[in-house]
């Protein structure tokens, strides 16, 4: 399918002008190639009428032009002084006329209505309000005022000053007669319907002295705003319906093949399951305006969308609406990234988030989509490092690999972490993407101890066990903070407080702190990566305590207060009937450090890797 997009149908009246906007993917080639507007003939050929290279056909001379807007990926064709002969089938496109990079546009130019002299024309959008002004002479001031609608040769009474209201206008029309001295009455019609369209007649008095005034009411369906967005990207529909419906339920719906409108989301809590996890209805402003954001755009999201207001939260005739025609461009600049990421309980996930590579300095965010009511997405982490408290020690946003992608790591997974998350920046909103985290059966691949307690001044050595499949990966330990996870520098950086010395074929990588200081307390992550692409992680919390008095720490295996089948153990692991119940934080992410000799003074932190004959259980 062609990635060029424009209005399918354009209608106007003789003598008027039209402006037709066509969209194209703003690649370097497309921005600079020829743009054209051509008319399809009976033979199927398309004859150029105007192009971006300056050509204008004789038929269009002096009344048409084509302007390219390469920075937006659009071009606009303006045609003035329309005649009935301009009705027909056209194409807007790129390159050569027959190549297929085009969009079909139907133009219909109709004859303007033959209106009686002195007819006032009122042009109003469906659902809105019109006020028809009806002047009269002093002598008709005390007489009956009325509004009729002309249908063919007959006139149907709509409303009069004797309290008659035509049933078709019930509860939405009123006739106002001003105080003395003002020789004008008004008829106000609310919530206009398409069927209200037509010629009306104001009348004051009767007989030959009556006052009459013709009014032509044109009720327009809102012209759909064309919206051109990339596959996998995001779209925002801004809906401003006016103060008169500020306190009425709002909705967004999509027009289906039967020309009815299926609710996508509304403020009454309804949401189409096809948009689960990727839609938000943002709170209304005081003026009743609101917006709907849809991320992770799919080709099947294309179509005509309407937003509106009605107490039922769905489309009803005569209520204000706004319209959009959404086109999803498959030649997307947004890279493919997994829409579902799977992790195991106790394990971790590393999520790749795309952003506009032109905005490398933008702030990056990650939020959790919550479906309740209209949906919300509270931020969990941002590139400046702020993390929601309940994610402390298990969530980090990394700028790597960069160049249009950042990484979010979440570990110590539980079933409650399953759900939809959004990647976003404070820059281009079209690059918002959605990822679903699913928690599946299995064991974490990286194994670290549960709660670890270090003693001030002593050596601490924590192992991280990994399966053979990670032998080709780079292993690391890092110390977590709310601004990221600081990897320990490698050995070739010279003497330092921390160094890495990891045998690449090993299946055990260890963190050594020697001697332990107060500053060592906190979360450590053990992880694997390939270049700038992060894999699994496991986290361990290291608590630091003062040296205990000798002999006060240990519990005898035969201690009387332990149940006969239960041993009280030292690290948060209870052993009952020979079954170890691991502390839920047994698996966590960490940084890698190297082993030093017996009671060595040497470097304070190091990483070591050593081979292991058995490999830990693997979930994959």
């Amino acid at each position: 399918k062609s990635p060029v997009f424009g209005p399918q149908e354009v209608s106007s009246v003789e003598g008027n002008s039209v402006s037709i906007k066509c969209y194209y993917p703003p690649t370097s080639v497309n921005r600079h190639t020829r743009k054209y507007w051509c008319r399809k003939g009976a033979s199927g050929r398309c004859i150029t009428l105007v192009s971006s290279e300056g050509y204008v056909s004789s038929n269009y001379a002096g009344r048409a032009n084509l302007t390219n807007f390469p920075e937006n990926g659009t071009f606009v064709v303006n045609i003035a002084q329309l005649s009935r002969d301009d009705s027909g089938h056209y194409k807007c496109g790129l390159g050569i006329n027959s190549r297929g990079l085009s969009f079909d546009v139907s133009l219909e130019v109709s004859q303007g209505p033959e209106l009686p002299n002195g007819t006032e024309v009122y042009t109003v959008d469906v659902g809105r309000t019109v006020t028809i002004k009806c002047p009269f002479k002093t002598e008709n001031a005390p007489k009956t005022k009325a509004l009729y609608k002309k249908i063919g040769q007959t006139s149907v009474l709509v409303i009069d000053s004797r309290n008659y209201v035509n049933p078709n206008y019930k509860d939405r029309i009123r006739l106002r007669i001003p105080g003395t001295g003002q020789l004008i009455f008004t008829v106000v019609i609310d919530r206009l319907r398409l069927s209200d369209h037509g010629l009306y007649l104001c009348q004051a008095g009767d007989g030959s002295n009556r006052d009459e005034k013709n009014a032509d009411l044109q009720v327009l369906e809102p012209e759909p705003e064309l919206v051109y967005e990339d596959l996998r990207g995001s779209v925002t529909f801004h809906c401003a319906l006016g103060l008169e419906v500020a306190n009425v339920a709002k909705f967004l719906c999509r027009v289906n093949s039967r020309e009815t409108c299926d609710v996508v989301i509304n403020t009454l809590g309804k949401r189409d399951s096809a948009f689960e996890g990727r839609i938000l209805l943002n709170p209304q402003d005081k003026d009743g305006s609101f917006s709907v954001v849809i991320t992770g755009l799919r080709k099947e999201d294309e179509g005509r969308y309407l937003c509106g207001a009605h107490s039922d939260g769905q489309l009803q005739e005569g209520w204000p609406i706004q319209a959009w025609q959404l086109f999803v461009n498959e030649e997307s600049t947004i890279p493919r990234s997994p829409t579902v990421v799977k992790g195991v309980a106790g394990g971790s996930v590393a999520v790749l988030c795309p952003y506009n590579p032109k905005e490398s300095q933008s702030l990056k965010y990650w939020c959790l989509w919550e479906g309740a009511q209209n949906g919300r997405c509270p931020l969990l982490v941002e590139s400046q490092g702020l993390v929601q408290e309940q994610y402390e020690g298990r969530l980090s946003l990394l700028q790597e690999p960069g160049n249009g992608t950042f990484t979010v790591i979440l570990n110590q997974l539980t079933t409650q972490d399953a759900g939809f998350y959004w990647c976003l920046t404070n820059g281009d909103t079209r690059w918002r993407t959605t990822v679903e985290i699913k928690i599946i059966e299995g064991e974490p691949n990286l194994k670290v101890p549960g709660n670890v307690t270090a003693v001030l001044g002593e050596t601490l050595n924590i192992p991280c066990h990994f399966p053979c499949k990670f032998s080709s990966y780079e292993k690391y330990w890092c110390k977590w903070s709310n601004t990221g996870c600081q990897t320990l520098p490698s050995q070739d950086e010279g003497p330092s407080e921390a160094f890495v010395n990891c045998d690449e074929n090993s299946r055990l990588v260890s963190l050594t702190l020697n001697p332990v200081t107060r500053a060592d307390e906190g979360w450590y992550w053990c992880g694997v990566k390939q270049g700038h692409f992060y894999g699994e992680t496991a986290a361990v919390y290291v608590a630091v305590e003062e040296k205990k008095v000798a002999g006060s720490r240990y519990v005898s295996p035969a201690k009387a207060d332990a149940a006969p089948d239960e041993k009280v153990l030292d690290s948060g692991v209870r052993e009952i009937e020979n079954k170890a119940i691991q502390d839920p934080r047994l698996f966590a992410e960490e940084k890698v450090v190297a082993d030093t000799g017996d009671q060595a003074g040497g470097s304070r932190a190091s990483v070591d890797s050593s081979s292991s004959e058995e490999q830990g259980g693997s979930s994959k």
Partner: nanobody, 125 residues
């Protein structure tokens, strides 16, 4: 999880040597993932730390009372840890326990997760 079985205890004369072994079995993680330690408990006394060794064998730590006399080693291929005791004294008489930990901590506060049943060492004068 890990099962630990000690062996090698017995009655010896003061000044003699003895070698205790601890065999580990179980498939939670491989043996060389665990730091190993030795403890002892004399009749009527608290259990006390004797020695520890990290999973690679590169780091060891001893209680002051045994430093220079006892040596701890491990053979990861055979899933065993050994405590070589020289110049034994009557004060060394105790039940000796082998322990395994998920991480290594130097000092006398070895973070044991798993314990053996113990083997008795008696040193007569």
């Amino acid at each position: 999880q890990v099962q630990l079985v000690e062996s090698g205890g017995g009655l010896v004369q003061a000044g003699d040597s003895l070698r205790l072994s601890c065999a580990a079995s179980g498939r939670t993680l491989s043996f060389d993932t665990y730091a190993m330690g030795w403890f002892r408990q004399a009749p009527g006394k608290e259990r006390e730390f004797v020695a520890s060794i990290d999973w690679s064998g590169g780091t060891t730590y001893y209680a002051d009372s045994v430093k220079g006399r006892f040596t701890v080693t491990r053979d990861n291929a055979k899933n065993t840890v050994t405590l070589r005791m020289n110049s034994l004294k009557p004060a060394d008489t105790a039940v000796y326990y082998c322990a395994a930990a998920q991480y290594y901590r130097s000092g006398t506060s070895f973070p044991a997760n798993y314990w053996g049943q113990g083997t008795l060492v008696t040193v007569s004068s």
